[in-house]
Interface confidence: low
């Protein structure tokens, strides 16, 4: 009887996103050792990295990865063709764009080639594991004497992303943040002309095209206004 362990991995949807299945074993041996969990992220729907902690193995082992898509035209078992390495031991696999099918259940299998019965299979919803590139080309426009508009671009279809804008002045202890939908623009209605503002943005593949939890990296910051830093008692704490 196969053991099936249901494990949450931070992208719960309507059904479990991740199932771990281990092969049965007759006796207590190396084959009972659990294999490391595989974590996959799809970067901007350009490539996907599936990685595991190779150092969790009791001795250095070149684990192998196979994958397929459940109940689809792409259900043929594929071997990893591009391994990632950590200290000359396999620690991941990179899949290219043509091998990524966001809306079909992705099945990934890790195996110990020296002990073929020692294997683990996970099922993942890739649309919940997309991480977009950071927003680019931030621009600020003065709409009126006291109103600023921030615009940015993403290297992805705009309607698939939501955004988080953070801004602060040189006098602020912390960032103020505002969620923004797919329209990728943000207005700040009341700007103090005596202060210097910093803005930054990050994006997430949610909610229209997937339910990803992970945000992109922050954009490069963009600044606006007077540089009053010399008189600012909080500056060094902010930049530390």
């Amino acid at each position: 009887l196969n053991t099936t362990i249901l494990t949450p991995n931070g992208n719960e949807d309507t059904t479990a996103d991740f199932f771990l299945t281990t092969m049965p074993t007759d006796s207590l041996s190396v084959s009972t050792l659990p294999l490391p969990e595989v974590q996959c992220f799809v970067f901007n729907v350009e490539y996907m990295n599936c990685t595991w902690n190779s150092s969790s193995e009791p001795q250095p082992t070149n684990l192998t990865l196979h994958y397929w898509y459940k109940n689809s035209d792409n259900d043929k078992v594929q071997k990893c063709s591009h391994y990632l390495f950590s200290e000359e031991i396999t620690s991941g696999c990179q899949l290219q764009k043509k091998e990524i099918h966001l809306y079909q259940t992705f099945v990934v299998q890790l195996q110990d080639p020296r002990e073929p019965r020692r294997q683990a299979t996970q099922m993942l919803k890739l649309q919940n594991l997309v991480i977009p590139w950071a927003p680019e080309n931030l621009t600020l426009h003065k709409l009126s004497e006291s109103q600023l508009e921030l615009n940015w671009n993403n290297r992805f279809l705009n309607h698939c992303l939501e955004h988080l804008v953070q801004y602060r002045t040189d006098w602020d202890h912390s960032w103020t943040e505002q969620s923004v939908d797919y329209r990728h623009k943000f207005s700040l209605p009341s700007v103090d002309g005596q202060k210097r503002y910093t803005f930054r943005v990050r994006s997430r593949f949610n909610p229209l095209c997937g339910s990803a939890q992970h945000w992109s990296e922050w954009s490069h910051p963009i600044h606006w206004g007077s540089n009053t830093s010399k008189e600012n008692p909080f500056l060094f704490a902010l930049e530390a």
Epitope: T14, V45, Y69, S72, Y103, Q104, Q127, L157, C160, C209
Partner: nanobody
């Protein structure tokens, strides 16, 4: 030959309803999330609703509670029930597999679309 055919559009008064249908060939439909897109004059095409092969649905905020997307996997059909229509819903409506749109946005083949006009 990959094909998409949208139908069901028309002229309707504000507050009225329409049901759009999309027939898709199996190679587009099978196992894919399907989306309804719209393009108003002078604007970019935007996704308004999507449905996965398992039936999970997503909507853009402006249509939530007014539009309902559904699919019939046996017939390779996708539907968009539109109610409480507003003038700003006026656009040509298209359907497509979301993944095809992501993978090759510039080259994704589109159906003819169906015109929805909301006006009194």
């Amino acid at each position: 030959q990959v094909q998409l055919q949208e139908s069901g559009g028309g002229l309707v008064q504000p507050g009225g309803s329409l049901r759009l249908s999309c027939a898709a060939s199996g190679s587009i439909f099978s196992g894919n999330a399907m989306g309804w897109y719209r393009q108003a004059p002078g604007k970019q095409r935007e996704l308004v609703a999507s449905i996965t092969s398992g039936g999970d649905t997503h909507y853009v905020d402006s249509v939530k509670g007014r539009f309902t997307i559904s699919r019939d996997n046996a017939k390779n059909m996708v539907y968009l029930q539109m109610s409480s229509l507003k003038p700003e819903d006026t656009a040509v409506y298209y359907c497509n597999a979301q993944e095809r749109v992501y993978s090759d946005y510039a080259f994704a083949s589109w159906g003819p679309g169906t015109q929805v006009t909301v006006s009194s």
